[in-house]
Interface confidence: low
């Protein structure tokens, strides 16, 4: 079938391949201090690391990309590490009428894969 | 709001930023010559190019990533160019009982964004 099994063990060594990592950021870092009230500090999960051949392939396209990158590295980029799913986060922010709680569905990564 | 407008003009010059590009590949390139009968050659649309700050941001997470990359480039990677949608492709392939047509929904990219 077109779907080879995505590889799950990192051939580059511990912590080198595509994985979820927490980055601490303040509202000032994000440029949000003027409109977000809370939380003042966010633990942002982000996808970092490399995508060696077939590691955590998102889909058939990513597998093809990995293969063609091996054949034509100057023309076809390697797959890269991006979120596969997100965790909803609630922010309290200023509105014209006061304060509001709003859920953001696409703000913090929950899982990563190579696309 | 958390959603800044993704930027659509490429500040790096024509063809340098994240875009769809056609790569020609044979079944041999893909390692599929033993099970796919047709087409012998595929025009594969792939996402290539760079993702400068806020260019075609996929979502809020990508905008945050772009901003934090500006602040901590060694820790937070820049967003990268990946498919935003796919075009279904029909492949004719061998089966135990003969020949079958199968649609692959995630094989050829139709649009790109920075994630």
């Amino acid at each position: 079938s077109a779907h080879a099994h995505p590889r799950d063990s990192c051939p580059l060594g511990p912590g080198r391949c595509c994985h979820l990592e927490t980055v601490q950021a303040t509202l000032e870092d994000l440029g949000w201090s003027d409109w977000v009230l809370s939380p003042r500090q966010l633990q942002l999960s982000m996808c970092v690391g490399e995508c060696p051949h077939l590691y955590r392939s998102a889909n058939t396209h990513a597998q093809i990309k990995a293969r063609l990158h091996g054949l034509q590295p100057d023309k076809v980029p390697a797959p890269c590490c991006v979120p596969s799913s997100y965790t909803p986060v609630v922010l309290m922010h200023r509105t014209d009428s006061g304060v509001s709680l709003q859920t953001y569905d696409d703000l913090v990564a929950r899982g990563c894969h190579c696309a | 709001s958390a959603h800044a407008h993704p930027r659509d003009s490429c500040p790096l010059g024509p063809g340098r930023c994240c875009h769809l590009e056609t790569v020609q590949a044979t079944l041999e390139d893909l390692g599929w010559s033993d099970w796919v009968l047709s087409p012998r050659q595929l025009q594969l649309s792939m996402c290539v190019g760079e993702c400068p700050h806020l260019y075609r941001s996929a979502n809020t997470h990508a905008q945050i990533k772009a901003r934090l990359h500006g602040l901590q480039p060694d820790k937070v990677p820049a967003p990268c160019c990946v498919p935003s949608s796919y075009t279904p492709v029909v492949l004719m392939h061998r089966t135990d009982s003969g020949v079958s047509l199968q649609t692959y929904d995630d094989l050829v990219a139709r649009g790109c964004h920075c994630a």
Epitope: G31 | H5, R7, D8, P11, L12, G13, H69
Partner: antibody, heavy 119, light 107 residues
Framework: QVQLVQSGAEVKKPGASVKVSCKAS????????INWVRQAPGQGLEWMGW????????NYAQKLQGRVTMTTDTSTSTAYMELRSLRSDDTAVYYC????????????WGQGTMVTVSS | DIQMTQSPSSVSASVGDRVTITCRAS??????LAWYQQKPGKAPKLLIY???SLQSGVPSRFSGSGSGTDFTLTISSLQPEDFATYYC?????????FGGGTKVEIK
């Protein structure tokens, strides 16, 4: 902290060239672009061009095309702007300014370099 | 090239006043607009990027709004240190262009 430190004031004769340097510190030089902006005495800001530190790609203002060259030296985290065939209306303060990523907004500026063109 | 037209070119105001400066682009630039403050003999300082985002360390009395072609910088309550010249800049495409500047003077 993030800093851009420019070379000192210059006095040049018409027809000569000037090369202004801009040394970056406090951040990864190759992850950012550098803009050059000038300001004639009592006038507004004029964008001259932009260079990506990581690849050396440039984009120059049309009116300066052919007279300006922007370069970077990644080994010393320094950007350079050379302006040739100087005229009296090139008298200005020249600023280098960093942009986040390769983006065009400029968040950190050098202190400026006064270039006087006079016979 | 995209032309940026700023108005007024100068404004006289008192401490505590609300000051509004406008900037108009000759074509749509989405939200790719920045505002800078410049004091005599000093380099410009970024106040607002992406039309409405406050740069880190800038007082919250500064705010930006607008999208497309029309943009506004507002200083909600003018302070003594705010007397300066303000510039808008479009970051939508090369060549980057600045507005002509607005000088905020003491009345």
């Amino acid at each position: 902290q993030v800093q851009l430190v420019q070379s000192g004031a210059e006095v040049k004769k018409p027809g000569a060239s000037v090369k202004v340097s801009c040394k970056a510190s406090g951040y990864t030089f190759t992850s950012y672009g550098i803009n050059w902006v000038r300001q004639a005495p009592g006038q507004g800001l004029e964008w001259m061009g932009w260079i990506t530190a990581y690849s050396g790609d440039t984009n120059y203002a049309q009116k300066l095309q052919g007279r300006v060259t922007m370069t970077t030296d990644t080994s010393t985290s320094t950007a350079y702007m050379e302006l040739r065939s100087l005229r009296s209306d090139d008298t200005a303060v020249y600023y280098c300014a960093r942009g986040p990523g390769q983006y065009a907004d400029v968040d950190v500026w050098g202190q400026g370099t006064m270039v006087t063109v006079s016979s | 090239d995209i032309q940026m037209t700023q108005s007024p070119s100068s404004v006289s105001a008192s401490v505590g006043d609300r000051v509004t400066i406008t900037c108009r682009a000759s074509q749509g630039i989405s939200s790719w607009l920045a505002w800078y403050q410049q004091k005599p003999g000093k380099a410009p300082k970024l106040l607002i990027y992406a039309a409405s985002s406050l740069q880190s360390g800038v007082p919250s009395r500064f705010s930006g709004s607008g999208s497309g072609t029309d943009f506004t910088l507002t200083i909600s309550s003018l302070q003594p240190e705010d007397f300066a010249t303000y510039y808008c800049q479009q970051a939508s495409q090369f060549p980057i262009t600045f507005g002509g500047g607005t000088k905020v003077e003491i009345k």
